[in-house]
């Protein structure tokens, strides 16, 4: 490329006209501020291409860089580009205007930058100051570019004197951005939604000021784009959040939603994904089994637990014998349903210091407008056994009888035992079990009654002893699932005048 005049720096008079010519072996073009000003392009007979740029009625605003480049750079050296800098000293133009991108200078590391305050006259003395400051800063100045150096996070202005007039530039704001490795977190208001409801996802990145968010989602693949919103509403600077909101979800919106965050300065990036399920209608599903018969022990506390999945959140009611239960003011019953994950719930019925009257038929019902489920069970109150009576008698028949009466729930078992050597029994000698039908010495008769009101069994057992020739320790033991109770009596022969 050949440029005439060759430059590389020209000083032209204000209001004058000036012609710049560029020629080359391929089509050429003049560029000014990334644009192509009106120019005359031609091709000579010898195959040389040229472009003529005529600058008319020059003003200070024509000051700046002019480039001549090949119009079509394919197959040519890409650095084939000639630069020319033109000054048009103009006392009516102080500093050349800057756009907003030039006034705010953002850095990500300590590096040399240029404060691009430029004047129209290369002879002018330009100084750099902190905004509203008088002291000139010792920074080198290039009339074509501005002040270059390492600057603190401050605002700066340039000053010059044109004639007897001091002129200030715009203020330049230098600001160091916070940039670090990226760590993205993604969450959704709900990962399960019904069709017609909204999907709202949030992607958060911490510690960066220069990030770009990109979402991929099922709807995007079908060309239906959703504009995310970026906000900064967390309790620290540089917590940046991008919100993707899809109103009125469709079944096809089910799938993977990915947030990709890039930071262009150091080329860092990270992405996280989350699955969203859009369901046709809500659901309630029981998880795990609960037996149809449940037990509680009298005067102890018992918690009955049901686990289920539901969406949307359901209403949970508990019933006993078809009557609705609520938290009792006396604190005897406590009901609670907790959300253990987004769609999983645990409902608990706690009976505090269980009473006999709390036995019965219990039902938990979980429901919402789309679905319902219920679970029922019988609650049995287990009552530890007690021996209520142990007595001995001498019927006329000559035999001796011992009667044992006791109660409990579930039904108690009765065990009779005897010990003939009172001195060594029961520590040294184990007692002998009685009531075996093969033995003629004793006979056993047991009756069981269920008391509906008390909801427990009563056992009455009578032991008939045929021959008692010396004192005998007879023991009655009642046993059930929740305990045992024992009483004993000394049975003496008829002939002996005393009885213990």
């Amino acid at each position: 490329l050949v440029v005439t005049p060759p430059g590389p720096e020209l000083v032209l008079n204000v209001s004058s006209t000036f012609v710049l010519t560029c020629s080359g072996s391929a089509p050429v073009v003049w560029e000014r501020m990334s644009q192509e000003p009106p120019q005359e392009m031609a091709k000579a007979q010898d195959g040389t291409f040229s472009s003529v740029l005529t600058l008319t009625n020059l003003t200070g605003l024509d000051t700046g860089e002019y480039f001549c480049t090949h119009n079509d750079s394919r197959g040519l050296e890409t650095d084939e580009r000639k630069r020319l800098y033109i000054f048009v000293p103009d006392p009516t133009v102080g500093f050349l205007p800057n756009d907003a991108e030039e006034l705010f200078i953002f850095l990500t590391e300590i590096t040399e930058i240029t404060i691009p305050c430029r004047v129209t006259d290369p002879q002018l003395v330009v100084t750099l100051h902190e905004k509203k400051g008088d002291v000139a800063l010792p920074v080198p100045y290039d009339h074509q570019r501005g002040f270059s150096g390492i600057f603190e996070d401050r605002s700066y202005i340039c000053k010059t004197t044109i004639g007897d007039r001091e002129v200030d530039s715009d203020a330049y704001y230098v600001y160091r951005l916070q940039v670090s490795s990226i760590n993205v977190s993604v969450n959704a208001v709900q990962t399960v939604v019904r069709q017609g409801e909204n999907i709202t996802l949030m992607c958060i990145v911490i510690g960066n000021e220069v990030v770009n968010f990109e979402w991929t989602y099922p709807r995007k693949e079908s060309g239906r784009l959703v504009e995310p919103v970026t906000d900064f509403l967390l309790d620290m600077p540089y917590h940046i959040r991008s919100i993707l909101h899809i109103p009125s979800a469709e079944l096809e919106d089910s799938g993977t939603y990915t947030c990709n965050v890039t930071e262009s300065v150091n080329d860092h990036q990270d992405e996280k994904a989350i699955n969203i399920t859009v369901v046709e209608s809500g659901y309630v599903r029981l998880l795990g089994e609960v037996g149809t018969l449940q037990f509680a022990e009298l005067h102890r506390s018992r918690t009955l637990q049901v686990v289920f999945e539901a969406y949307p959140p359901p209403t949970v009611l508990w019933f006993k014998d078809n009557r609705t239960l609520g938290d009792s003011s006396a604190g005897e019953i406590a009901l609670s349903t907790r959300n253990v994950s987004e769609t999983r719930y645990v409902s608990e019925l706690t009976l505090v210091r269980v009473k006999v009257a709390e036995a019965g038929h219990y039902t938990m019902r979980a429901f919402h407008e789309d679905a319902e489920v219920q679970l029922s069970f019988q609650l049995q109150i287990n009552v530890p056994v007690r021996v209520l009576e142990l007595s001995e008698s001498h019927p006329d028949s000559g035999e001796q009888t011992v009667r044992c009466r006791g109660r409990g729930m579930p039904q108690p078992n009765i065990i009779w035992s005897a010990c003939r050597d009172l001195k060594r029994c029961p520590r040294e000698l184990p007692p002998t079990l009685l009531g075996n039908s093969s033995e003629e010495e004793s006979q056993l008769e047991t009756n069981v009654t269920y008391w509906e009101e008390e909801q427990e069994f009563e056992v009455v057992s009578t032991l008939r002893l045929q021959h008692v020739d010396r004192p005998l320790s007879v023991r009655c033991t009642l046993r059930n699932a929740v305990g045992q109770d024992t009483q004993e009596v000394i049975v003496v022969p008829h002939s002996l005048p005393f009885k213990v």
Epitope: E102, F106, N208, E209, N212, L233, D235, P237
Partner: antibody, heavy 127, light 107 residues
Framework: EVQLVQSGGSLVQPGGSLRLSCTAS????????MSWVRQAPGKGLEWVAN????????YYVDSVKGRFSISRDNAKKSLYLQMNSLRAEDTAVYFC????????????????????WGQGTLVTVSS | AIRMTQSPSTLSASVGDRVTITCRAS??????LAWYQQKPGKAPNLLIY???SLESGVPSRFSGSGSGTEFTLTISGLQPDDFATYYC?????????FGQGTKLEIK
């Protein structure tokens, strides 16, 4: 010297209209967002409206939406506030201000405050 | 809209005192907060931007701190020229809101 000079304030009847002007000098007006802020007698500051460099974005406080219109003429280095359907509660000193909103960095915005203010002009709405 | 609440509304102090004015936002605003000083009959003057950056030409006795929802302006060593009304102002998505102001008066 960087300055903003205001004009256009006056007494106007309720329901009337008024146009405020603010002329900039000493800086590249076309490179900055601009705002209007008002202050009712004896009260605090209230932001009214702002406008982006090329008028592509304009924002208003709720109480003036549909009644006030902000505009600018970069060639004349001027900012305007057209006020229609004026009410007694619009009585205030109106300030124009240069609003330092840098171009956004990625998806992040910055804000450096309102650093240059006009001298203020009084608008009185009364019958 | 984001509400800004300043406290106290009035503050009495003496020359040389250290004073603190608090500004609370109704929701987090990151560090998008500016502080202004206004004297009667005058336009406001920018003191602090981005919560803690001191505007050029503002004396170093002024300082700002905070982020999220709670911010403070501190003046250490009050000068006679500092008795004025102070306003905080938030920026969010191009709207702005000022606090109701704190009048700093001579005790």
């Amino acid at each position: 010297e960087v300055q903003l000079v205001q004009s256009g304030g006056s007494l106007v009847q309720p329901g009337g209209s008024l146009r405020l002007s603010c002329t900039a000098s000493g800086f590249t007006f076309s490179s900055y967002w601009m705002s209007w802020v008002r202050q009712a007698p004896g009260k605090g500051l209230e932001w009214v409206a702002n406008i982006q460099q090329d008028e592509s974005e304009k924002y208003y406080v709720d109480s003036v939406k549909g009644r006030f219109s902000i505009s600018r003429d970069n060639a004349k280095k001027s900012l305007y506030l057209q006020m229609n359907s004026l009410r007694a509660e619009d009585t205030a000193v109106y300030f124009c201000a240069r609003d330092l909103v840098p171009p956004r960095q990625g998806d992040y915005y910055h804000y450096f405050g309102m650093d240059v203010w006009g001298q203020g002009t009084l608008v009185t709405v009364s019958s | 809209a984001i509400r800004m609440t300043q406290s106290p509304s009035t503050l009495s102090a003496s020359v040389g005192d250290r004073v603190t004015i608090t500004c609370r936002a109704s929701q987090s605003i990151s560090d998008w907060l500016a502080w202004y000083q206004q004297k009667p009959g005058k336009a406001p003057n920018l003191l602090i931007y981005k919560a803690s950056s001191l505007e050029s030409g503002v004396p170093s006795r002024f300082s700002g701190s905070g982020s999220g929802t709670e911010f403070t302006l501190t003046i250490s060593g009050l000068q006679p020229d500092d008795f004025a009304t102070y306003y905080c102002q938030q920026y969010n998505s191009y709207s702005r809101t000022f606090g109701q102001g704190t009048k700093l008066e001579i005790k």
